[in-house]
Interface confidence: low
């Protein structure tokens, strides 16, 4: 025997209190599939969360974060404070990157500069708190007697790490 609830479309629920007829989801709730016996409560984007997409009878609300914060976790389950480039977020707030480290984004941690010498290369552009170093060609890349002109480094523009 077919379950009468299977005929209830998305946006409704199968109401056992009313002889299993399909009732519209109540305010601020939704059902994204048919045949549901209850509707789910819509997510509320409050405080530091901001509504990215409103709830409807068939789909949940989606949140993002207010300016100065960014999403973390699946479906933006948390909002974390932004820092400036050249900083990282600690328990005591935004702190400048220590010497020898950088962060080119408003989120995440400071990472060590690339060690050019590990690849047998020299430092072409020094690193900063906001940018990684740019590694240049190794001394052996030049033949004796060849003028040591500076060569463009692929991917060496600001914001890119050259390994």
């Amino acid at each position: 025997l077919q379950d009468p609830c299977s005929n209830c479309p998305a946006g409704t629920f199968c109401d056992n209190n009313r002889n299993q007829i399909c009732s519209p989801c109540p305010p601020n709730s939704f059902s994204s599939a048919g045949g549901q016996r209850t509707c789910d409560i819509c997510r509320q984007c409050k405080g530091v969360f901001r509504t990215r997409k409103e709830c409807s009878s068939t789909s949940n609300a989606e949140c993002d974060c207010t300016p100065g914060f960014h999403c973390l976790g699946a479906g933006c389950s948390m909002c974390e404070q932004d820092c400036k480039q050249g900083q990282e977020l600690t328990k005591k707030g935004c702190k400048d990157c220590c010497f020898g480290t950088f962060n080119d984004q408003k989120r995440g941690i400071c990472r060590p500069w690339t060690n050019c010498s590990l690849d047998g290369k020299s430092v072409l552009v020094n690193g900063t708190k906001e940018r990684d170093v740019v590694c240049g060609p190794s001394p052996t890349d030049f033949s004796p007697g060849t003028p040591s002109t500076t060569m463009p480094v692929p991917g060496g523009e600001p914001g890119h790490t050259s390994h």
Partner: antibody, heavy 114, light 110 residues
Framework: QSLEESGGRLVTPGTPLTLTCTVS????????MSWVRQAPGKGLEWIGY?????SLYYASWAKGRFTISRTSTTVDLKMTSLTTEDTATYFC???????????WGPGTLVTVSS | DIVMTQTPASVSEPVGGTVTINCQAS??????LAWYQQKPGQRPKRLIY???DLASGVPSRFSASGSGTEYALTISDLESADAATYYC????????????FGGGTEVVVK
Amino acid sequence: QSLEESGGRLVTPGTPLTLTCTVSGFSLNDYWMSWVRQAPGKGLEWIGYIDVGGSLYYASWAKGRFTISRTSTTVDLKMTSLTTEDTATYFCARGGLTYGFDLWGPGTLVTVSS
Amino acid sequence: DIVMTQTPASVSEPVGGTVTINCQASEDISSYLAWYQQKPGQRPKRLIYGASDLASGVPSRFSASGSGTEYALTISDLESADAATYYCHYYATISGLGVAFGGGTEVVVK
């Protein structure tokens, strides 16, 4: 982010009229949109909603005579069988189940007179 | 449809005074209530949503409370700029109950 209504004018009773709400700075796929009207010297009166999925909700008095539809950047209100009682400023407003109506257009005046 | 009954229709208070506007819903509206301010010839401006949450940029002189069927908006330390008409608004409609506005309260600041 802004809303702008257009299409309001003087019409005679029985004339159909379509109002348009043009949105900028946000996507209609992410917000419910409503039409609300206000007769001269009177209060606000809700006409209907279109939700993010395109589903429509109307005030009981508006069903049949008012139709809401949308494109990617506009929300239209089609009105038929207009009477002098429909003379009002018509507003479009953004918002749904979370915040109420957080953004309003300046309104467009519809005058129905013989 | 839900009916929102707003009282009083008009109130007059001096600068620095306090005004309270009440709104009664014909059935439980679960705090899906907003308050708006409207000045003549202007669009409404949202002040409160969720019965008590202050909208961004709204001074803390505006406060609201309520649950179930009874809600109230309070304006303290009245300023001349607060002279306007205020509306309550039930805004959840998925149930088919329909959206509804109160009839409005005119606030006159003396």
